[in-house]
Amino acid sequence: DAHKSEVAHRFKDLGEENFKALVLIAFAQYLQQCPFEDHVKLVNEVTEFAKTCVADESAENCDKSLHTLFGDKLCTVATLRETYGEMADCCAKQEPERNECFLQHKDDNPNLPRLVRPEVDVMCTAFHDNEETFLKKYLYEIARRHPYFYAPELLFFAKRYKAAFTECCQAADKAACLLPKLDELRDEGKASSAKQRLKCASLQKFGERAFKAWAVARLSQRFPKAEFAEVSKLVTDLTKVHTECCHGDLLECADDRADLAKYICENQDSISSKLKECCEKPLLEKSHCIAEVENDEMPADLPSLAADFVESKDVCKNYAEAKDVFLGMFLYEYARRHPDYSVVLLLRLAKTYETTLEKCCAAADPHECYAKVFDEFKPLVEEPQNLIKQNCELFEQLGEYKFQNALLVRYTKKVPQVSTPTLVEVSRNLGKVGSKCCKHPEAKRMPCAEDYLSVVLNQLCVLHEKTPVSDRVTKCCTESLVNRRPCFSALEVDETYVPKEFNAETFTFHADICTLSEKERQIKKQTALVELVKHKPKATKEQLKAVMDDFAAFVEKCCKADDKETCFAEEGKKLVAASQAALGL
């Protein structure tokens, strides 16, 4: 499928609007500090060049790879060295090393100002004045803050963003119409970004085989009526799509994702009965819908797994002939029967099965050796079940905010070296598992909870990788992708940690806390809680609860006072003294 000009091929396939949007996303994900106007200029130059190649594929430079064309364009930025430091050294390299170098410099936590939402009237005016620039700015701001955001999915978010403004800027009460929609897009966007970040981490840190195993398990749960060969084809295609997007090849990724959606819809009879509605939608909605589609019903009377994978005399023969295919079939068969299991649990079972075969197929009596392999699965299944049961009970007892606080204390004691903002962000997200998953019936709890926790713990892993401070975090993050959650769960209080020096400034608060939103106020309190645990890691739950209750009362009192700032200064000193006494600081 060779084309004389790759850039012309992608421009024609995607159309000018999507082409420009995807190039903007790609550039913003690479050069995260560059001003919007500079990126727009570069994108316009690339687009004009692409048009010359569409007109004449033999024109100068049209035969160059997209990495070469895009890399050359990025390397013309006049302040590359000053703004990006050593990333400028990437420009001295040739492809493909140059692109690899750019990828390595993507920053999961870029030093960018928080996005502040302007007044609704201001946003609506900007939207009406220049809709195109307004939407480009949305793509740019999201892409630079989320350098691994799934690009074709970001186009879908932008479409919804545009629809929200189109509808709500004409509404009688613009704010009532628009703000809930923007909140929903923000929350969904953060979740989408985190899910994609895990896919990219899986591919980049653990390799294609790990990603394919994940995809076999997930697609087998989703499409249990599909044949193994069909699932394998979908896995291969999906792996290509995500490899491209994670590698910065956004045009190819979007093009291949569209092809995959087309294939799925053309073959839905042999894939799933749940796809009909998705396949009637336009392209971006269709792809999103397929990615989120509910699990199809399991085929009736599936035979016992034991027959093919334990009782058969050909187990070792089949395994030896094609190890990965046989393990893939095992994973497919197990997953399609168990929509009630998390993907990571299914992968742990497959790993246990593989380890057993590796050992037993070399033994004197292989069958005798692996005959009880399914018994080894029981504790692996029970561990997440029990954990989820306990934590859902705790969540129901405490509510989300206090459940988050319990996790904050738990994780700060496990890995106190991790930065406070990271501990707050990760623990808050871990705590959201309660409202997200505990409402589900038993059969849906584990896939919801444990697979969500994998996404959140990956956030911890990528943030920690940027500035590693804890060997325990590094160990849990790097040893095994599927055992990350059990690894963190198993961590006890870090006895080697030297408590942080007490700093009164950390616990000094001002009247500005009174004007914060409830969420921001919670974050302030949770930040103080983490700092408290870092100062006194041996503090009991009761001690910490008493201090936090006093703190909440202090904030409430001073926010009602006439002279708030004086109240915060005077009462704050008393609170710090009382807290020190209560905790023995």
Epitope: D72, K73, C75, T76, R81, A88, C91, A92
Partner: nanobody
Amino acid sequence: EVQLVESGGGLVQPGGSLHLSCAASRLTTGVTFSDYGMAWFRQAPGAERELLANINWSGQYTNYRDSVKGRAAIFRDNAKNTLYLNINSLKAEDTAVYYCAASSRKYGPGIKSQYEWWGQGTQVTVSS
């Protein structure tokens, strides 16, 4: 190989304009001026040499440092083997030695280390 010679420097009044040229000669046989990405740099006393503007081989694409964006123009005439830089609304901070540079990377890199050939520089002083 290419030899670069800048001209057009001197004393200029604040608010005035600057017109610099850079003539390329002694090009290797079979190599043309359009085989090079070009740039203008400047170096003020006690400061590092900084990229002001860069241009690709054909002259189609240009980039500027923020401090001169909107008041500078880089362009080239490949038939005359010459690079130009115009800056207007000059300020005292524009006082520096201005250098022309050539790169074998035809796209005109934004990084000093990727320019292999340099002129001797021309002094520009902005003062009343």
